[in-house]
């Protein structure tokens, strides 16, 4: 399927609007600090060039690869060295090394100002004045802050963003209409970004085989009626799509994702009975819908797994002939029977099965060696079940905020070297598992909770990788993708940690806390809690609770005072002294 001009091919396939949007996303994800106007200029130049290639595929430079064309364009940025430092050295390299170099410099935590939402009238005016620029700016701001955001899905978010403004800017109460929609898009966007970040980490850190195993398990749960060959084909195609997007090949990724959605809808009879509604939607909605579609019903009367994978005399023969195919079949068969298991649990079972066969098939009596392998899965299944049960009970007892605080204390004690903002962000997200998953019945709790925790712990891993400070975090993050959560769960208090020096400034608060939103106020308090644990890692739950209750009362009191600033200064000193005494600081 070779084309004389790759850029012309993608322009024609995607259309001008999507082409321009995807190039903007690609550039913003690579050069995260560049001003919006500079990116728009680069995108326009690339688009004009693409049009010349559509008109004549043999025109000069039209035969160049997209990496070459885009890389050359990025390397024309005048301030590259001043703004990005050593990333400028990428421009001295040739493709494919140059693109790899750009990828390595993507920053998961760029030093960018927080996005502040303007007044609704201001936003609506900007939307009406120049809709195209307004929407481009949305793509730019999201892409530069989330350099691994799934590009075709970002197009879907932008479409919903546009629809929200189109509808709400003519509503009687613009704010009541718009703000909940923007909140929903923000929250969904953060979740989408984190999920995609895990897919990219899986591919980049653990390789294609790890991603394919994940995809086999997930798609087999979702499409239990599909044949193994069908699932394998979907896995191959899905792996190509995500490899491209994670590698910065956004045009190819979006194009291939559209092809995959088309294939799924054309073959839904042999894939799933749940796809009908999705397949009636326009392209972006269709792809999103397929990605989120509920699990199909399991076929009736599926035979026992033991027959083919334990009792058969051909187990070792079948394994030896095609190891990955045989293990893939095991994973497919197990996953389609267990929508109640998390994907990571299914992968742990498959890994255990693989290791067991690897050792047993070399033994004198292989069957005697692996005969009861399925019985040995029991503790692997029970461990996440028990953990989820205990934590959901704790969540129901405490509520989300206090549950987050319990996790903040737990994780700060495990890995106190990690930066306070990272511990707060990650623990808050870990705590959201309660409201997200504990409401579900037993059969849906584990896939919801443990697969969500994998996404959140990956955030910890990628943030920590940028500035590594803890060997324990590095170990849990790098040893095994599927065992990250059990690895972190197994960590006890870090006895080697030397408590942080007490700094009164850390616990000094001002009247500005009173004007913060409830969420921002919680973050302030949770930041103080982490610092408290770093100062006194041996503090008991009761001691910490007492100090935090005093702190909450102090904030409430001073926010009601006439002279707030004086109250914060005077009462704050007393609180610090009382806290020091209570904790023996």
């Amino acid at each position: 399927d070779a084309h004389k001009s790759e850029v012309a091919h993608r322009f024609k396939d995607l259309g001008e609007e999507n082409f321009k949007a995807l190039v903007l996303i690609a550039f913003a994800q690579y050069l995260q600090q560049c001003p919006f106007e500079d990116h728009v200029k680069l995108v326009n130049e690339v688009t004009e060039f693409a049009k010349t290639c559509v008109a004549d595929e043999s025109a000069e430079n039209c035969d160049k690869s997209l990496h070459t064309l885009f890389g050359d364009k990025l390397c024309t940025v005048a301030t590259l060295r001043e703004t990005y430092g050593e990333m400028a050295d990428c421009c001295a390299k040739q493709e494919p090394e140059r693109n790899e170099c750009f990828l390595q410099h993507k920053d998961d935590n760029p030093n960018l100002p927080r996005l502040v939402r303007p007044e609704v009238d201001v936003m609506c005016t900007a939307f009406h004045d120049n809709e195209e620029t307004f929407l481009k700016k949305y793509l730019y701001e999201i892409a530069r802050r989330h350099p691994y955001f799934y590009a075709p899905e970002l197009l879907f978010f932008a479409k919903r963003y546009k629809a929200a403004f189109t509808e709400c800017c003519q509503a009687a109460d613009k704010a009541a209409c718009l703000l909940p929609k923007l909140d929903e898009l923000r929250d969904e966007g953060k979740a989408s970004s984190a999920k995609q970040r895990l897919k990219c980490a899986s591919l980049q850190k653990f390789g294609e085989r790890a991603f394919k195993a994940w995809a086999v398990a997930r798609l087999s749960q979702r499409f239990p009626k599909a044949e193994f060959a069908e699932v394998s084909k979907l896995v191959t195609d899905l792996t190509k799509v995500h490899t491209e997007c994670c590698h910065g090949d956004l045009l190819e990724c979006a194009d291939d994702r559209a092809d995959l959605a088309k294939y799924i809808c054309e073959n839904q009879d042999s894939i799933s009975s749940k796809l009908k509604e999705c397949c009636e939607k326009p392209l972006l909605e269709k792809s999103h819908c397929i990605a989120e579609v509920e699990n199909d019903e399991m076929p009736a009367d599926l035979p026992s797994l033991a027959a083919d994978f334990v009792e058969s005399k051909d187990v070792c023969k079948n394994y030896a002939e095609a190891k990955d195919v045989f293990l893939g079949m095991f994973l497919y068969e197990y996953a389609r029977r267990h929508p109640d298991y998390s994907v990571v649990l299914l992968l742990r079972l498959a890994k255990t099965y693989e290791t067991t066969l690897e050792k047993c098939c070399a033994a004198a009596d292989p069957h005697e060696c692996y005969a009861k392998v399925f019985d040995e899965f029991k503790p692997l299944v029970e461990e996440p079940q028990n953990l989820i049960k205990q934590n959901c009970e704790l969540f129901e007892q405490l509520g989300e905020y206090k549950f987050q605080n319990a996790l903040l204390v737990r994780y700060t004690k495990k890995v106190p070297q990690v930066s306070t903002p990272t511990l707060v962000e990650v623990s808050r997200n870990l705590g959201k598992v309660g409201s997200k998953c504990c409401k579900h019945p037993e059969a849906k709790r584990m896939p919801c909770a443990e697969d969500y925790l994998s996404v959140v712990l990956n955030q910890l891993c990628v943030l920590h990788e940028k500035t590594p400070v803890s060997d324990r975090v590095t170990k849990c993050c790098t040893e095994s993708l599927v065992n990250r959560r059990p690895c972190f769960s197994a960590l006890e208090v870090d006895e080697t940690y030397v408590p942080k020096e007490f700094n009164a400034e850390t616990f000094t608060f001002h009247a500005d806390i009173c004007t913060l939103s409830e969420k921002e106020r919680q973050i302030k308090k949770q930041t103080a809690l982490v610092e408290l644990v770093k100062h006194k890692p041996k503090a008991t739950k009761e001691q910490l609770k007492a100090v935090m209750d005093d702190f909450a009362a102090f904030v409430e009191k001073c926010c009601k005072a006439d002279d707030k600033e004086t109250c914060f200064a005077e009462e704050g000193k007393k609180l610090v002294a009382a806290s020091q005494a209570a904790l023996g600081l």
Epitope: C360, A362, A363, Y370
Partner: nanobody, 124 residues
Amino acid sequence: EVQLVESGGGLVQPGGSLRLSCAASGRTFSPYTMGWFRQASGKERESVAATTWTGSRSYYGESVKGRFTISRDSTKNTMSLQMNSLKPEDTAVYYCAAADGAGLYTNRGQYDYWGQGTQVTVSS
């Protein structure tokens, strides 16, 4: 990585009893089989007993059947070997070993992790 530490070795009279213990640490949240091996002076290291992760299946070498009992507490990541009716020919360095996976492994080559060993001497 799984780290293993044996304890409980010592000098015992023929017909006496001894209990060896092995504590595992490290990556103990993945399934692993545990076993005991022994090596007498100038001899090959031989398999004594093994037990799976759940402790639901066990294996014993011919020379110790009926006298030795292997047990495991997965929650505490410990394994023990109760040795009764000890004979002079049981004198050896006893090694605790662990192997990834969930099979009942009986061969030395199947084991991935080893302890330092503890001396058992049966003599009057």
